[in-house]
């Protein structure tokens, strides 16, 4: 296993619709053809897997049908979008990149993006 640098923004504020997008960029030492991207969430010392996708260079990322993540790739960058976020989902979202093929296997883990999620203010009751 060889180490690889992964960069991602430190802080992102999700939209009022609970959508957060950020770029995860990795310094590929070679010409990988198969890449796996995993998003991990760290909150109160607990780390959980949010979503993961394996893709072939030049192809779209394919997450599971029920995944809250979508993404696109361009060169050594992966543009990740996480949807359906609520205030309770505020936390550190860590991008993990693995170069699966061809060998050697490389692993890179970013410092994490702190995603702040603000629940929209409830609309005041109105009489019609």
């Amino acid at each position: 296993c060889k180490a690889m640098h992964v960069a991602q923004p430190a802080v992102v504020l999700a939209s009022s619709r609970g959508i957060a997008s950020f770029v995860c960029e990795y310094a590929s030492p070679g010409k990988a053809t198969e890449v796996r991207v995993t998003v991990l969430r760290q909150a109160d010392s607990q780390v959980t897997e949010v979503c993961a996708a394996t893709y072939m260079m030049g192809n779209e990322l394919t997450f599971l049908d029920d995944s809250i993540c979508t993404g696109t790739s361009s060169g050594n960058q992966v543009n990740l979008t996480i949807q359906g976020l609520r205030a309770m989902d505020t936390g550190l979202y860590i991008c993990k990149v693995e170069l699966m093929y061809p060998p050697p296997y490389y692993l890179g883990i970013g410092n994490g993006t702190q995603i702040y999620v603000i629940d929209p203010e409830p609309c005041p009751d109105s009489d019609f």
Epitope: A10, V11, L13, S16, A43, A87, G112, Y116
Partner: antibody
Framework: QVQLVQSGAEVKKPGASVKVSCKAS????????ISWVRQAPGQGLEWMGW????????NYAQKLQGRVTMTTDTSTNTAYMELRSLRSDDTAVYYC??????????WGQGTLVTVSS | EIVLTQSPGTLSLSPGERATLSCRAS???????LAWYQQKPGQAPRLLIY???SRATGIPDRFSGSGSGTDFTLTISRLEPEDFAVYYC?????????FGPGTKVDIK
């Protein structure tokens, strides 16, 4: 080193608007957020809101909603806070601070805004 | 809105003494999002503690933070002359981010 430098003191009449700037240096501006906090004379700190420099999304304190606008200019690494319809109780020192993963640091030196007729 | 209450309002102590400042939240706050700041007259606030217990860069180890849930504490083990100031706690886990009213530590 990481530094935030704010614009100079302002004197405004009630009903006018003020726009305070906060120029960042020493770090990747778009990787972080900028929060704005004010402090009336002899009073405590009041959080006004913040902006994510990465995507421009904002989160404002409800009491200021509709009167405040926070923006960034990523070409100059500068954040702005505009406050409209000024009242005498808006007289305060206005601070910007970098929003990190779980901290506000560092802070700008502060900008005194005086609202007086 | 999470309301933070700080006590005491003023703490009168002598250099060398231990200072214990309290910050109580009206509802539970994730310890990841609780900070303490020091402010001296005419100066901007300075971050001391973030994540309830992590010291910010360059902060002497006489400053320590602890607590979880609704009760948080800032301790200054031995007061130095430069520590006499106002201290604020802040939560930034739930919007609106809020500050406590502050505790003034002055010379006895």
């Amino acid at each position: 080193q990481v530094q935030l430098v704010q614009s100079g003191a302002e004197v405004k009449k009630p009903g006018a608007s003020v726009k305070v700037s906060c120029k960042a240096s020493g770090y990747t501006f778009t990787s972080y957020g900028i929060s704005w906090v004010r402090q009336a004379p002899g009073q405590g700190l009041e959080w006004m809101g913040w902006i994510s420099a990465y995507n421009g999304n904002t989160n404002y304190a409800q009491k200021l909603q509709g009167r405040v606008t926070m923006t960034t200019d990523t070409s100059t690494n500068t954040a702005y806070m505009e406050l409209r319809s000024l009242r005498s109780d808006d007289t305060a020192v206005y601070y910007c601070a970098r929003v990190g993963a779980n901290w506000f640091d560092p802070w700008g030196q502060g900008t005194l805004v005086t609202v007086s007729s | 809105e999470i309301v933070l209450t700080q006590s005491p309002g003023t703490l009168s102590l002598s250099p060398g003494e231990r200072a214990t400042l309290s910050c109580r939240a009206s509802q539970s706050v994730s310890s990841s999002y609780l900070a303490w700041y020091q402010q001296k007259p005419g100066q901007a606030p300075r971050l001391l503690i973030y994540g309830a217990s992590s010291r910010a860069t360059g902060i002497p180890d006489r400053f320590s933070g602890s607590g979880s849930g609704t009760d948080f504490t800032l301790t200054i083990s031995r007061l130095e002359p430069e520590d006499f100031a106002v201290y604020y706690c802040q939560q930034y886990g739930i919007s609106p981010f809020t500050f406590g009213p502050g505790t003034k530590v002055d010379i006895k």
